[in-house]
Every structure is written in C-alpha cells, then in structure tokens.
C-alpha cells in the first residue's frame, strides 16, 4: 500500500510511462498522513 503524501504511483506515473514502466493504480489510505509533514 502507498502511505506517502503524494503516492509514488501518482507522482511517477508520467516518468514511468515514458520509460516503459508499469504503474499500478493505488491510493493513499485516508487514516495515514504524510511522512513529509
């Protein structure tokens, strides 16, 4: 699961698609906050 503030799957989607990577659709759990806070 993705517990980060702006979920890696969202943020790196463009980069991965341009480099041929595959992105799994995921989400940030609503009860877990951001490690960047």
């Amino acid at each position: 699961s993705c517990n980060t503030a702006t979920c890696v799957t969202h943020r790196l989607a463009g980069l991965l698609s341009r480099s041929g990577g595959v992105v799994k659709d995921n989400f940030v759990p609503t009860n877990v906050g951001s490690e960047a806070f």
Partner: antibody
Framework: EVQLVESGGGLVQPGGSLRLSCAAS????????ISWVRQAPGKGLEWVAE??????????HYAEAVKGRFTISRDNAKNSLYLQMNSLRAEDTAVYYC?????????????WGQGTLVTVSS | EIVLTQSPATLSLSPGERATLSCKAS??????VSWYQQKPGQAPRLLIY???NRYLGIPARFSGSGSGTDFTLTISSLEPEDFAVYYC?????????FGQGTKLEIK
C-alpha cells in the same frame, strides 16, 4: 524561489469570522498537501487542518478543536490555500502558518510561510 | 489522539557539546516522526523526517533515530546557531500532533 505568503489575519471579536489566505509560488502547488499550523503566543505548535493534493481528491482533515468551525480549501488555478474561520474563540488567538509538503518516495519537500497573526478579543 | 512527550523541557549546554533530545509517543507511530527547529520570530524549519532522514541542506551534525514509540534527535557538536526550540511531530494518525518542545539554551 519558493514562497508561501499568508494574509488575512487581524483582530476579531469572539464569535466573529476571518478568512486566511496563503499564496504559493515557485513550486507545483497542485501536487502538494497543505496544512495550517498555529502557535499561540509563547506556546508550542498545533496542527489545525490539512487538505490533500488534487490527485488525492483534495481530501480534508481537521483538529477536533476546530471541526465544524473552520474550513480549509484550495484553488489550484490561483495557487492559493484558504482557511475560513467562523465562531472564533479567544483560544484561537495564534500565529497561523501554512505548510506545503510533498512526498515523492525517494525524498520530500517541506515549505513554511512566515505566518499571520489572528487575535480574538473583545 | 497520539500524545508526544519531549524531554527534557530545557537543555543547557555549551557549543561543541553533544545534545540528545527525546520524544516519546503514547502509541506506535512507526517512523512517521519529524523534528523541527524554531527560533524566535521565525517559522519552524524541518530538520529530520521519517524519524531518521535529514532534510535538504541540513548539516550532518543533526541526526534522528528511533521507531515505534521512542525517538531521538542528536546534535553531535553544537554550533552557536543551534540554540533554539526543537519540536517533534507525528503524522501517522490524525490529528497530527507535536510535542511540547525542548528549549536548547547556552550554558
């Protein structure tokens, strides 16, 4: 250059309302989660509210002390964050900071504004 | 709500000495702990995130450790500019919370 500039603070009577703004520049505002954090005079830090990024549905969370009275919102087109504060109490007196943060897995970004003072007094 | 308890409340040390600040959480917060430095009249400044990761531009003399409920901020050799108030925070659960702060003062 990254900047977060809060405005809208001032003196308000108990029971009154204020709307704080936070203008962002120098980074991709829509990607960031943003919180308001406050600090009463001579006291510690207290988290107030958070709004998540556009891709995280702009979900909101609030501290119990402000739930039902404060509303956090954002306008990504204007790179702006807002805090609508209603039914203000003396204990809401504080410097209010906006804080933007971004976690991209390998590292993070964390930016604070300079704060705006809200004084609730009759 | 997760309560963070910092100790000591005040720490009096001299430049060049080692500072050890503690933060204890009332419930497990894995590694979702940050440390902030605040000087009078200024906004807080992030030092450490994820319990042990130094933020961009933070000198190597600052280090963080811990997981679960017990966390430590260590400043290996104090510089004059390090005397300030330090706060820990947790973002593992809502509401996000801060410790009450440790004031690091010059002895």
């Amino acid at each position: 250059e990254v900047q977060l500039v809060e405005s809208g603070g001032g003196l308000v009577q108990p029971g009154g309302s204020l709307r704080l703004s936070c203008a962002a520049s120098g980074f991709t505002f829509s990607n960031y989660w943003i919180s308001w954090v406050r600090q009463a005079p001579g006291k510690g830090l207290e988290w107030v509210a958070e709004i998540r990024s556009e891709s995280d549905a702009s979900a909101t969370h609030y501290a119990e002390a402000v739930k039902g009275r404060f509303t956090i919102s954002r306008d990504n087109a204007k790179n702006s964050l807002y805090l609508q504060m209603n039914s203000l109490r003396a204990e809401d007196t504080a410097v209010y900071y906006c804080l933007a943060y971004f976690d991209y897995g390998l590292a993070i970004q964390n930016y604070w504004g300079q704060g705006t003072l809200v004084t609730v007094s009759s | 709500e997760i309560v963070l308890t910092q100790s000591p409340a005040t720490l009096s040390l001299s430049p060049g000495e080692r500072a050890t600040l503690s933060c204890k959480a009332s419930k497990r917060v894995t590694t979702y702990v940050s440390w902030y430095q605040q000087k009078p009249g200024q906004a807080p400044r992030l030092l450490i995130y994820g319990a042990s990761n130094r933020y961009l531009g933070i000198p190597a003399r600052f280090s963080g450790s811990g997981s679960g409920t017990d966390f430590t901020l260590t400043i290996s050799s104090l510089e004059p500019e390090d005397f300030a108030v330090y706060y820990c925070s947790q973002s593992y659960n809502y509401p996000y919370t801060f410790g009450q702060g440790t004031k690091l003062e010059i002895k």
